[in-house]
């Protein structure tokens, strides 16, 4: 089956301090290679999560990525801050022959808007 990386939501809004899920599914697990999430594009893009065993604070996988037929690479970002705003891309790589893995396809991106946390005013009578 032809490989396609799908990010169904073009954008999501989340209140500061809350958590949000960024969805990403693949149509094929071949060719082999890791899936990674980035914020931004180009040389300055920031690695947010990699499905290669490392620990990323505040970011977890949503489904059990250890299933050999898993094609759901959605992530949850917890305790969102205003600095987390931006466009997130789910990227599929093909393993490289003794060299860096090659990016072969990216999802369309999901823009995260971070809303100010509503302030709670206590009124004393």
């Amino acid at each position: 089956k032809e490989l396609k990386v799908t990010q169904p939501e073009k954008s999501v809004s989340v209140a500061a301090g809350d958590s949000t899920v960024l969805n990403c599914t693949l149509t094929s697990l071949l060719p082999v290679g890791p899936i990674k999430w980035y914020r931004g594009v180009g040389q300055s893009r920031l690695l947010i999560y990699s499905f290669t065993g490392e620990h990323f604070p505040r970011v977890t996988n949503v489904s059990d990525a250890t299933k050999r037929n898993n094609m759901d690479f959605s992530i949850r970002i917890s305790n969102v801050t205003p600095e987390d705003a931006g466009t997130y891309y789910c990227v599929k790589f093909q393993k490289g022959p003794s060299e860096p893995d090659t990016e072969i396809q990216s999802g369309g991106g999901t823009e995260v808007y971070v809303l100010a946390k509503p302030s709670h005013h206590h009124h004393h009578h």
Partner: antibody
Framework: EVQLVESGGGVVQPGGSLRLSCAAS????????MSWVRQAPGKGLEWVAG????????YYPASVKGRFTISRDNSKNTLYLQMNSLRAEDTAVYYC???????????WGQGTLVTVSS | SYELTQPPSVSVSPGQTARITCSGG??????YAWYQQKPGQAPVTLIY???KRPSNIPERFSGSSSGTTVTLTISGVQAEDEADYYC???????????FGGGTKLTVLG
């Protein structure tokens, strides 16, 4: 320090059953897929079963499918291998192994010997 | 029979370089690893993901890949490197973990 300790091996008659256990420590057991690999006397390594971290998905080669069942209890940090309808060719040292993110093996137990003989 | 193919034996003098090859898997669906096993002991992982070395493994062990063949290279071979070496794989197309038949490394002298 990652530790995997197998137990439950022994001598069993052809057609019999045996359950192996693997006690894991030193890592977050519930986050890792696990496998069983065996080695017949004087022979090479053979993968016999794999299981996802959550335990819902299991995998086997044709040589043991329908006879062996892999399972896990994440609350006890323990991996199991239930072996039924055992044959002489199942005689081997059985190792439990932790899987990497791409289903290779990074840590191995010391093994437990299973002998199928009448 | 083993799905992956590696030579049954390799001999090398101390200080020389040993190379063990493994072939048989599809490049697009396979990841490879190398395991060392000494007599009476459990296997030890030397290389995973074709060329990644665990932090506790000496730098003289390295892995590389070219097409459908992967190679374990042991530079400056030492007497303690005498062991059996197994190539192992993960095949994403079948969800299985094939092994090679093993290579016995003999350190001469």
């Amino acid at each position: 320090e990652v530790q995997l300790v197998e137990s439950g091996g022994g001598v069993v008659q052809p057609g019999g059953s045996l359950r192996l256990s693997c006690a894991a420590s030193g890592f977050t057991f519930s986050s890792n897929a696990m496998s069983w690999v065996r080695q017949a006397p004087g022979k090479g390594l053979e993968w016999v079963a794999g299981i996802s971290a959550g335990g819902s998905d299991t995998y086997y080669p044709a040589s043991v499918k329908g006879r062996f069942t892999i399972s896990r209890d994440n609350s006890k940090n323990t991996l199991y291998l239930q072996m039924n309808s055992l044959r002489a060719e199942d005689t081997a040292v059985y190792y439990c192994a932790r899987e990497t993110w791409n289903h290779l093996f990074d840590y191995w137990g010391q093994g437990t010997l299973v002998t199928v003989s009448s | 029979s083993y799905e992956l193919t590696q030579p049954p034996s390799v001999s090398v003098s101390p200080g020389q370089t040993a190379r063990i090859t493994c072939s048989g898997g599809s490049y697009s669906s396979y990841y490879y690893a190398w395991y060392q096993q000494k007599p009476g002991q459990a296997p030890v992982t030397l290389i995973y993901s074709d060329d990644k070395r665990p932090s506790n493994i000496p730098e003289r062990f390295s892995g590389s890949s070219s097409g459908t063949t992967v190679t374990l290279t042991i530079s400056g071979v030492q007497a303690e490197d005498e062991a059996d070496y197994y190539c192992g794989g993960y095949d994403q197309s079948s969800y299985t973990n094939p092994f090679g038949g093993g290579t016995k490394l003999t350190v001469l002298g």
